[in-house]
Amino acid sequence: IVGGTNSSWGEWPWQVSLQVKLTAQRHLCGGSLIGHQWVLTAAHCFDGLPLQDVWRIYSGILNLSDITKDTPFSQIKEIIIHQNYKVSEGNHDIALIKLQAPLNYTEFQKPICLPSKGDTSTIYTNCWVTGWGFSKEKGEIQNILQKVNIPLVTNEECQKRYQDYKITQRMVCAGYKEGGKDACKGDSGGPLVCKHNGMWRLVGITSWGEGCARREQPGVYTKVAEYMDWILEKTQSSDGKAQMQSPA
């Protein structure tokens, strides 16, 4: 996160760290807990690393440096990448992770509510992006979970800023015209959440941007509301019943 500040314990209890253990262990992506056994993240996090057993998912943590060999983590039972995601495109950058064992909810580890299907009418004015990613383009992974308040921008405005790309209605953009605040490398897959009527909702999944926090280059996020049918289909067909946090 560029231009962010430290988060507090329990402030973003749905935020998880997706880490890979090969020879060493490192944080690669963020994710959002959406049910006892489900994490929503970005499909591109798994490019070149589709093997389930190399991944470790840490939930209920604030500081990555607190992780030791004794810190509990979740393992992956199944990775479900959107069927239309292609490595050669930036579309449908969304994936579900089914955990091997369900997680208990605590003050520091609980799910984020999902938006209503095709939610286009809600005007979100209080949106935040969180993650342990770089604090500048040529930076490094941060120890303490960072947060930053970023306004949404219209898809029309976003398309103007990214003429070489196709900004679809299944994407949502956020950023300041002057730059300075944005997600960055290592924040991929993490949440863009907005508070509406006193409730936090998962509006976007951190997907891509041209550099980080550059002027007139907003961050681009996968629009969760556009994938609600897919999320419900995959979680229900796997579970037999839905266990998602839907909005009240």
């Epitope: 050669s88 930036g90 579309n91 790309y165 196709k166 490398k185 290592g186 991929s188 941007g209 041209e210």
Partner: antibody, heavy 125, light 108 residues
């Protein structure tokens, strides 16, 4: 299966014009940035021009700026290169290529993942 | 413009040998925008490596790419007969997009 098929090459006199076409199939053409690359006989590869998915944004190499025009018709899945005021140094095999733009670590990637077989343009009197 | 300088110009090696091809750029290039292509006579170029180190679909694991910033390397661990040809590095970080002049890998 992704396919790119160029046509329109041939022999033309200096100062003449030619229009190359590239017919695309096997993918959603309107989602991809497309490019032209050329290769003079016995020489290396030279990027010529690219066009955004919508066709609204184009960029050219200095060597062809003001003489060549790239365009596309997404309804016909076809890319074009209109070449005017041709010179002997424009003699080359012209390739069209699809520009893949995936995502890696929150940044976009860019590379030419599929190429046509090329069409030869010879500028000579 | 970003200049791409490949070395050596020609590499004469026997099958089974290791080939190391270098590509230097005149300015910093984001690794995501660095690719390698192979071209054999009479054929269109073929994508080998993108993002400086990711193998394209169907490319055997004897091909590997490394590098960061201004220095990039393509390695062929054990040359096979079909690997002979010309190899180009290319950047699309900044326009004009540019290619290296190529390294020809020939049979010794």
């Amino acid at each position: 299966e992704v396919q790119l098929l160029e046509s329109g090459g041939g022999l033309v006199q200096p100062g003449g014009s030619l229009r190359l076409s590239c017919a695309a199939s096997g993918f959603t053409f309107s989602h991809y940035l497309m490019t032209w690359v050329r290769q003079a006989p016995g020489k290396g590869l030279e990027w010529v021009s690219y066009i955004s998915p919508s066709g609204g944004h184009t960029i050219y190499a200095d060597s062809v700026k003001g003489r060549f025009t790239i365009s596309r018709d997404n309804s016909k899945n076809t890319l074009y290169l209109q070449m005017n005021s041709l010179r002997a140094e424009d003699t080359a095999v012209y390739y069209c290529a699809r520009v893949a733009r995936g995502i890696a670590a929150r940044q976009r990637t860019s590379y030419y993942d599929y190429w046509g077989q090329g069409t030869l343009v010879t500028v000579s009197s | 413009d970003i200049q791409m300088t490949q070395s050596p110009g020609t590499l004469s090696l026997s099958p089974g040998e290791r080939a190391t091809l270098s590509c230097r750029t005149s300015q910093f290039v984001n690794s995501n925008y660095l690719a390698w292509y192979q071209q054999t006579p009479g054929q269109a170029p073929r994508l080998l490596i993108y993002g400086a180190s990711s193998r394209a679909t169907g490319i055997p694991d004897r091909f590997s790419g490394t590098g960061y910033g201004t220095d990039f390397t393509l390695t062929i661990s054990r040359l096979e007969p079909e690997d002979y040809g010309t190899y180009y590095c290319q950047q699309s970080s900044r326009t004009p997009w540019t290619f290296g002049q190529g390294t020809r890998v020939e049979i010794k």
